[in-house]
């Protein structure tokens, strides 16, 4: 009978190991080992045994020992199991985004590795085991499905092998492959909120704002902001799971007519779009035209309005008959008209809104200069040393300039407060003079002695 | 000045129908004329406006369900394309034109409205 | 979009008590507000234009007040005729898409 030691053993690939072949009989005819691994005997050996050191060991194998006794001829294997860690561990790559709510795939390769019933796979959140299972085929395949939650962005997965050879070896092995991060989103299937204008008028401002709730992570979320074929270059405030872009926009008269708004929130590899239309319109204030805007008293003027062609509008609160953009009314001018105002108010409905323009315009009638017994009384009659103020007063437009003379020198303090003396008595000519002529009116001032009382 | 809608009858679902509104005392080519309506024990609801040139506006829900049009200076048509069960309302005309002689500006204003006419959609 | 918002729904009043109903607009409809209202059968009747202006044969303890964004209908020394459902409306649009009246305010006089 021949007799291996030991019987089984473990080994590192490429490792080494002693054998012994020993035969029953004190003095067997032959005894060896038939092996097909570099073996070299190391003597001195006993007279039943021998002992071979086998290197190199790349697979596994099972050197046989044979002897040849009187009573016969036998053999005996040893079963060597080469054990090697995997070459290549290796994680799929992961989406770039992983919606929440659906759930992900995590594969994981592995080549290599030895022997196969001690290799195990697992995949990993961190440190937190997701699964295990037994590494099968070449290269070995492991996949496992998991949900994913707001809760697993950042987070870092991982594949690792453990080839576990224990009792026979004290030790486990373990390789883990490079770790993936995984970055999930969250994006509504509620569009954006679109606040805008729905009529713009041309050269002026108006304000956008789009806003979108319930995003994560709202600071990886883009916003895309167009009015027609101009970018707006929005201001974004972020929120707990909210953003609101607030753009400013200003509209040319080339793009007068419909446009649409269009609000854009990107996040992972997804878009929400709202659209809207926006009505640009160009509506100059209307134009007040009067005949002349200076005109004598008596003159007739025209005073007409005139506004964009779809506008209707209003002449100091009279709208145009029939309804439209020009309205006009004759007037003959008195100096009551003089600063007054003529008001066209001009209305405009744009896309079913209704906006509104005013101008005003002033005329000015030219009148005078004018001196009324009403304004300058031609006689006055007051006490000695009483105390007066003698009034008279000019009209006319332009104003006209007034002065009352006695004798040509003696001029009367107008609008002044005096003491009345004798030398005030006489009869002044009081003249109002103008670019557009003059006037004189007598005035008799009559002082009253206190000796006549 | 008046305003009268007629057309309303009881009609089975899916056969358009054709409410007519007629005004007197002034024209349309001066005013916007608004249809609106009101279904049992519910409140008005704005259905369009014609303006005085023939443009016309629809609130979101009426858009492609209604077509308003001028047929002549004193009627206007409101077809409902396809009727259905939730069509059953009176169907009221309105004029929805004024204007502010203080500031000088046209606004919508309804001050004016027919009697109503009762639609019913019933299979 | 004005959105018109109206409050309360209903309100109970007794006979010659104050009534005060409100009406929100989402945005500024300067004083391009009128209020109606309507009896049941018949058509709407307008009361009150550009927010405070009394309509033509209405009577004066209807009061309309507010301008921009908020706009109140006063209704004092309420009568038995004054039940009915009353609605506000915006003058100030009728773009596509657009919300006209308010949700209504049905007065009910004890």
């Known amino acids: 009978q021949t007799s291996v030691f030991p019987p089984e053993v473990i080994l590192p690939r490429g490792g080494s190991v002693k054998v012994n072949c020993s035969a029953s009989c004190d003095q067997p005819i032959s005894l060896g080992m038939e092996t097909p691994l570099p073996k070299k005997e190391i003597l001195p050996g006993g007279n039943n045994w021998k002992m071979y050191e086998l290197s190199n060991v790349q697979e596994d194998s099972q050197p046989m020992c044979y002897s040849n006794c009187p009573d016969g001829q036998s053999s005996a294997k040893t079963l060597l199991t080469v054990y090697w860690t995997p070459e290549r561990v290796e994680l799929a790559p992961l989406p770039p985004w992983q919606p929440v709510g659906k759930n992900l795939t995590l594969r994981c390769q592995v080549e290599g590795g030895a022997p196969r019933a001690n290799l195990t796979v697992m995949l990993l959140r961190g440190e937190k085991e997701l699964s295990r299972q037994s590494a099968v085929g070449e290269p070995a395949e492991v996949t496992t499905t998991v949900p994913v939650g707001r809760d697993d962005h950042g987070a870092n997965f991982s594949c690792r092998t453990e080839l576990d050879l224990r009792p026979y070896v004290l030790k486990l092995f373990e390789n883990t492959s490079a770790p993936h991060q995984l970055q999930t989103f969250d994006l509504p299937a509620t569009p954006p909120q679109l606040v805008s204008p729905q009529v713009l008028e041309v050269d002026t401002q108006g304000t956008v704002v789009c806003s979108l709730d319930g995003l994560f992570p709202v600071s990886e979320a883009q916003v895309s902001l167009a009015l027609g074929d101009q970018k707006l270059n929005p201001t974004i405030t972020y929120g707990n799971n909210s953003l609101s872009a607030k753009a400013s926009v200003k509209v040319t008269a080339e793009e007068e007519g419909t446009q649409q708004l269009l609000c854009g929130v990107m996040l992972g590899n997804q878009t929400q779009e709202t659209r809207q239309t926006v009505t640009i319109y160009s509506f100059p204030a209307p134009n007040v035209n009067l005949t002349k805007p200076e005109v004598s008293e008596g003159t007739e003027v025209i005073v007409e309005c005139e506004a964009h062609p779809r506008a209707k509008v209003m002449l100091n609160g009279v709208p145009a008959q029939p309804p439209g953009p020009r309205a006009q009314f004759l007037l003959k001018a008195t100096p009551e008209d003089n600063g007054r105002s003529f008001s066209c108010s001009a209305t405009l409905e744009v896309a079913g809104q209704l906006v509104h323009k005013n101008q005003t315009r002033e005329l000015r009638v030219l009148y005078g200069p004018r001196l009324d017994e009403k304004d300058c009384p031609g006689n006055w009659t007051w006490p000695e040393n009483s105390q007066q103020t003698p009034m008279c007063q000019a009209w006319g437009n332009p104003l006209p300039q007034l002065k009352c003379l006695k004798d040509g020198t003696f001029p009367l303090p107008i609008g002044q407060s005096v003491t009345v003396t004798r030398d005030l008595e006489g009869t002044y000519l009081c003249q109002a003079r103008s670019t557009r002529g003059e006037v004189t009116r007598e005035v008799t001032v009559n002082v009253l002695s206190p000796r006549y009382e | 000045q008046s305003v009268e809608e007629s057309g309303g009858r009881l009609v089975t679902p899916g056969t358009p129908l054709t409410l007519t509104c007629t005004v007197s005392g002034f024209s349309l080519s001066d005013y916007y004329m608004s249809w609106v309506r009101q279904a049992p024990g519910k409140g008005l609801e704005w259905i369009g406006i014609i303006s005085d040139s023939g443009s016309t506006y629809y609130a979101s829900w009426a858009k492609g369900r209604f077509t308003i049009s001028k047929t002549s200076s004193t009627t206007v048509d409101l077809k409902i394309t396809s009727p259905t069960t939730e069509d059953t309302a009176t169907y009221f005309c309105a004029r929805d034109w004024s204007y502010d002689s203080s500031s000088g500006y046209y606004y919508y204003d309804m001050d004016l409205w027919g009697p109503g006419t009762l639609v019913t959609v019933s299979a | 979009a004005y959105d018109m918002t109206q409050t309360p729904a209903s309100v109970e009043v007794a006979v010659g008590g104050t009534v005060t109903i409100k009406c929100q607009a989402s945005?500024?409809?300067?004083?391009?507000l009128s209020w109606f209202h309507q009896k049941p059968g018949q058509p709407p009747k307008r009361l009150i234009y550009?927010?405070?202006t009394l309509a033509s044969g209405v009577s004066s303890r209807f009061k309309g007040s507010g301008s921009g964004t908020q706009f109140t209908l006063t209704i004092s020394g309420v009568e038995s005729a004054d039940a009915a459902t009353y609605y506000c409306?915006?003058?100030?649009?009728?773009?596509?898409?657009?919300?006209?009246f308010g949700g209504g305010t049905e007065v009910v006089v004890k």
């Open positions: 409306q915006q003058g100030y649009s009728r773009s596509d898409g657009e919300h006209v």
């Open positions: 945005q500024s409809i300067n004083s391009w």
């Open positions: 550009k927010a405070s």
